[in-house]
């Protein structure tokens, strides 16, 4: 089975790599524009230059192309805690990221928010904080993990999952209470 190609891909596949088929004359292959530029005018004929112009400030193309317009530079989302890692150039989009000791939490494929890495207070770092993943903590005895924070077993309710982890402490607390009433 031949994979379905869009019209643009079909037209491009007729020409050698780095060239595209003239939209008005399918016997002419024009040279694509370099990254950082866009197509202003198609080449007038075989072997003649394509008219490519440099992208204006605030726009870019990151690969060779025959786009009629450059792409708009992305803006980092300050309200999501994002910071600019590198600014937009004519051939590269803005790179957004998080500050030191923060990680990215993706709400969707194209939207991330920066959160502080957990410090593992009352525990130890099992896995260090990564670009896209929070620190993984292991808690000290007498503490259990809740939302990646080590919480005292004194906050463990019997109905919760923490009862398994806090079982010795819960029994000790119960024993102390019993001995206090005799």
């Amino acid at each position: 089975l031949v994979p379905h190609l869009g019209d643009r891909e079909k037209r491009d596949s007729v020409c050698p790599q780095g060239k595209y088929i003239h939209p008005q004359n399918n016997s002419i292959c024009c040279t694509k524009c370099h990254k950082g530029t866009y197509l202003y005018n198609d080449c007038p004929g075989p072997g003649q230059d394509t008219d490519c112009r440099e992208c204006e400030s605030g726009s870019f193309t990151a690969s060779e192309n025959h786009l009629r317009h450059c792409l708009s530079c992305s803006k980092c989302r300050k309200e999501m805690g994002q910071v600019e890692i590198s600014s937009c150039t004519v051939d590269r989009d803005t790179v957004c990221g998080c500050r030191k000791n923060q990680y990215r939490h993706y709400w969707s494929e194209n939207l991330f928010q920066c959160f502080n890495c957990s410090l593992c207070l009352n525990g130890t770092v099992h896995l260090s904080c990564q670009e896209k993943q929070n620190t993984v903590c292991t808690c000290h005895a007498g503490f259990f993990l809740r939302e990646n924070e080590c919480v005292s077993c004194s906050n463990c309710k019997k109905s919760l999952e923490c009862t398994k982890l806090c079982l010795p402490q819960i029994e000790n607390v119960k024993g102390t209470e019993d001995s206090g009433t005799t």
């Epitope: 989302r77 309200e79 939490h105 928010q113 959160f115 502080n116 939302e147 990646n148």
Partner: nanobody, 119 residues
């Protein structure tokens, strides 16, 4: 005490529309980013949309982009979700929540309103 009260859910046919509202109290509403999240039957909580505190920035899950619109009226302490072109897979309990600031977890959310999309 933070209180969030959703309304506007109901039964709607595929392709139909609904507008959800969320009345907020117990905190300074205009200072907080707000979100809509949903929980389909037998599924986990899914983030749907977020709006910044002033309303100038809006974000959507890919599954609802182009169909749902989040908005807010800070003078009325109310959050809205306009849902168009509804699909069966949009069936869920919809909750409004304060958008998280310190960790990726919704600390404060309402009791929810059920949206059922069925013919």
């Amino acid at each position: 005490e933070v209180q969030l009260l959703e309304s506007g859910g109901g039964l709607v046919q595929p392709g139909g529309s609904l507008r959800l509202s969320c009345a907020a109290s117990g905190f300074t509403f205009p200072e907080y980013g707000m979100a809509w999240v949903r929980q389909a039957p037998g599924k986990g909580l899914e983030w749907v949309s977020t709006i910044s505190h002033g309303g100038e920035h809006t974000y959507y899950a890919d599954s609802v982009k182009g169909r749902f619109t989040i908005s807010r009226d800070n003078s009325k302490n109310t959050l809205y979700l306009q849902m168009n072109s509804l699909r069966a897979e949009d069936t869920a309990v919809y909750y409004c929540a304060q958008h998280p600031v310190s960790h990726p977890k919704f600390d404060y959310w309402g009791q929810g309103t059920l949206v059922t999309v069925s013919s």
